[in-house]
């Protein structure tokens, strides 16, 4: 079992990258002198207790920043949030921490990230640039749920 996080960079099909702005992740076109975040990801160690056919359950964090992506309901709406959390603490927990887990599915070069806590809700960016990452159920044109994940070794 790999028990250190892997590092990766993410961009969407419009070549926008993830940038941290005021504790919020936004997707913006890549430019010079811009510092996209490096993603830290690690598979859930309790994979045998999660659904087998939805993808690889992973914790997603920002490398070196002690921030992890999580899903929580605000009112009736599942929302994507960044929480101060050590990804290895999540990994070592006695149970899957579903609010911080995403099913990572790959199809060719495209990756999707589906919330484990809210099945059917995916990490997405609006088709317009400069918008925060969100969770969506709408897999249509308004939002992009396909991302390119490049592992950094």
């Amino acid at each position: 079992k790999i028990d250190t996080p892997q590092r990766g960079s993410i961009q969407d099909i419009n070549h926008r990258v993830w940038v941290l702005q005021d504790q919020t992740l936004i997707a913006v076109p890549r430019k010079d002198r811009m510092s996209p975040v490096t993603i830290a990801l690690i598979s859930c160690r309790h994979v045998e207790t999660l659904e087998k056919d939805r993808g690889n359950p992973i914790y997603l964090g920002l490398n070196g920043l002690n921030l992890c992506l999580m899903c929580a309901k605000v009112g009736d709406q599942p929302t994507l949030q960044l929480k101060e959390k050590d990804i290895m603490d999540l990994y070592n927990q006695p149970e899957p921490v579903k609010s911080f887990l995403f099913y990572h599915s790959q199809s060719g070069r495209n990756s999707t990230f589906e919330s484990v806590a809210f099945p059917g809700w995916f990490i997405a960016v609006s088709s317009e640039g400069g918008c925060p990452l969100i969770l969506t159920q709408e897999l249509g044109k308004a939002n992009t749920t396909d991302f390119g994940l490049t592992m950094l070794f």
Epitope: L50, Q93, P94, E95
Partner: antibody, heavy 121, light 110 residues
Amino acid sequence: EVQLQQSGAELVKPGASVKLTCTASGFNIKDTYIYWVKQRPAQGLEWIGRIDPANAYTKFDPKFQGKATLTADTSSNTAYLQLSSLTSEDTAVYYCTRFHWYGSSFFFDYWGQGTTLTVSS
Amino acid sequence: QAVVTQESALTTSPGETVTLTCRSSTGAVTTSNYANWVQEKPDHLFTGLIGGTDNRPPGVPARFSGSLIGDKAALTITGAQTEDEAIYFCALWYSNLWVFGGGTKLTVLG
């Protein structure tokens, strides 16, 4: 108010099986894990295992594998512990407890009142 | 399988600070054991007090705190009250199962 209500005391013959019930109110069992714990007279607590009611996946202490079966019915917000091939060693109080994440950690926060099982001929 | 050991009984007085400990037969207790503490009062009334070594869930009085002291997990009651008379169990996580201690019977005189 969060509550776990367990079924009443059982007197069962050796070799038989029994199914204990834990009905939750004040929360949805799909949003948490349900653990089962055994307490024998004048002894400590023993972890039996757990169920994730959202997907029915279970985990057990190896010594209860084959002895205990855990199930859940999310429509009635109820978890079940079935014990088979009963012997006097199974005479105990059995508790269900919610194992819940609060943002920083998991806790055995709410417990049922326990079901007393007596195995005797 | 690991054995988890607690003091069998402790006595304190109202207002005093008392510390209960939890030892593992496999070596030092660490944060990776995610020590939990639960309280049992008469009539099988259990309440969770501490999770993840040192975290308190909502509704648990601030006089209860968890920590690691040396090679053991510890539950400290700062300013014990008569209603704290109970049996206290610790539970430690060992990668794939939970093991409970035998419990500490705490008497609060007065």
